[in-house]
């Protein structure tokens, strides 16, 4: 359930991604799949940092949700888990009311 | 009926251990997150911590990190408060509650009675 | 972390005021706030969750409203057993719990 592939551990490390605010981020990557296993256990929004959202292509074949939690660990969901698709509309209406969703690009090498 | 019964408070020394259980009865218990909250005597309540649902997450807030460690065990439908090296600080009435939700509606309305756990030398 | 001002710390008031009470919070949690009522010796009741939203068994003169980071809980004409401590709750970054205002009777 809280499996991260090798990809997306040496990505942790080796990132300089500043800091953004707000919780959605969407990530255009040259990687291959990250996610090795998927949850779709439901983990309430109060102890969810950030979302990263990972658009198929560039080697990988689906769409892919990585949740960083308050406390400090990582989890792959399934995109299609209800929660997790209510929880990103809510945030996306919240941020085109403020914010807008960040987008970073990773140049393709 | 939704039902939270606190254990195990009483008097230690600082640098001491305690334990404290919750026994839940009433509702499924592994359907919910659960927390402990704690409120010093006189004062206001502060969240301690929160587990999932078949407690493979967990979370603190920062003066207990390392120090208290929050679990359950589905089968008996209880949930525990292991804390260790206790300071005079940490003296209050503990309480455990519901908190799971997905649209807000079941956070922390379940409450137990609470157990008093006092750190004095 | 999150911050909650609760305001006033005490009231005084009679039965049949209306009361109302202020949480603040130091970032905009949208409608993710709690109101409970806790009475001497006893655990919290929890009156209004989501900002708005009234407990089942809770009488109607308790109300909430607020959104990002203002939020009040108000009593539209108190009643005896009303006199007990509240305490807001935001919920949408872990927890952290208003200070509290003392209810008291006039």
């Known amino acids: 359930m809280k499996f991260i592939s090798t990809s997306l551990l040496l990505m942790l490390l080796v990132s300089s991604l500043s800091p953004v605010q707000g919780v959605l981020e969407v990530y255009y990557t040259s990687l291959r799949c990250r996610c090795v296993q998927e949850s779709s256990v439901f983990i309430p929004r109060r102890f969810i940092d950030r979302i990263q959202i990972l658009p198929r292509g560039n080697g990988c074949p689906r769409k892919e949700i990585i949740v960083w939690k308050k406390n400090k660990s990582i989890v792959c969901v399934d995109p299609q888990a209800e929660w997790i698709q209510r929880m990103m509309e809510v945030l996306r209406k919240r941020s085109s009311s403020t914010l807008p969703v960040p987008v970073f690009k990773r140049k393709i090498p | 009926e939704v039902q939270l019964v606190e254990s195990g408070g009483g008097l230690v020394q600082p640098g001491g251990s305690l334990r404290l259980s919750c026994a839940a009865s009433?509702?499924?218990?592994?359907?919910?997150?659960m927390a402990w909250v704690r409120q010093a005597p006189g004062k206001g309540l502060e969240w301690v911590a929160s587990?999932?649902?078949?407690?493979?997450?967990?979370y603190y807030r920062d003066s207990v990190k390392g120090r208290f460690t929050i679990s359950r065990d589905n089968a008996k439908n209880s949930l525990y408060l292991q804390m260790n090296s206790l300071r005079a600080e940490d003296t209050a009435v503990y309480y455990c509650?519901?908190?799971?939700?997905?649209?807000?509606?079941?956070?922390?309305?379940?409450w137990g009675q609470g157990t008093l756990v006092t750190v004095s030398s | 972390d999150i911050q909650m001002t609760q305001s006033p710390s005490s009231l005084s008031a009679s039965v049949g005021d209306r009361v109302t009470i202020t949480c603040k919070a130091s970032?905009?949690?949208?409608?993710?706030l709690t109101w409970y009522q806790q009475k001497p010796g006893k655990a919290p009741k929890r009156l209004i969750y989501?900002?708005?939203i009234l407990q089942t068994g809770v009488p109607s003169r308790f109300s909430g409203s607020g959104s990002g980071t203002e939020f009040t809980l108000t009593i539209s004409s108190l009643q005896p057993e009303d006199f007990a401590t509240y305490f807001c709750?935001?919920?949408?970054?872990?927890?952290?719990f208003g200070q509290g205002t003392k209810l008291e009777i006039k």
């Open positions: 970032q905009n949690i949208n409608k993710e």
């Open positions: 587990i999932n649902y078949d407690g493979g997450d967990t």
């Open positions: 509650a519901t908190e799971e939700d997905y649209d807000g509606s079941y956070v922390m309305d379940a």
């Open positions: 009433g509702f499924t218990f592994s359907d919910y997150y």
């Open positions: 709750l935001q919920q949408s970054s872990l927890y952290t």
């Open positions: 989501n900002t708005n």
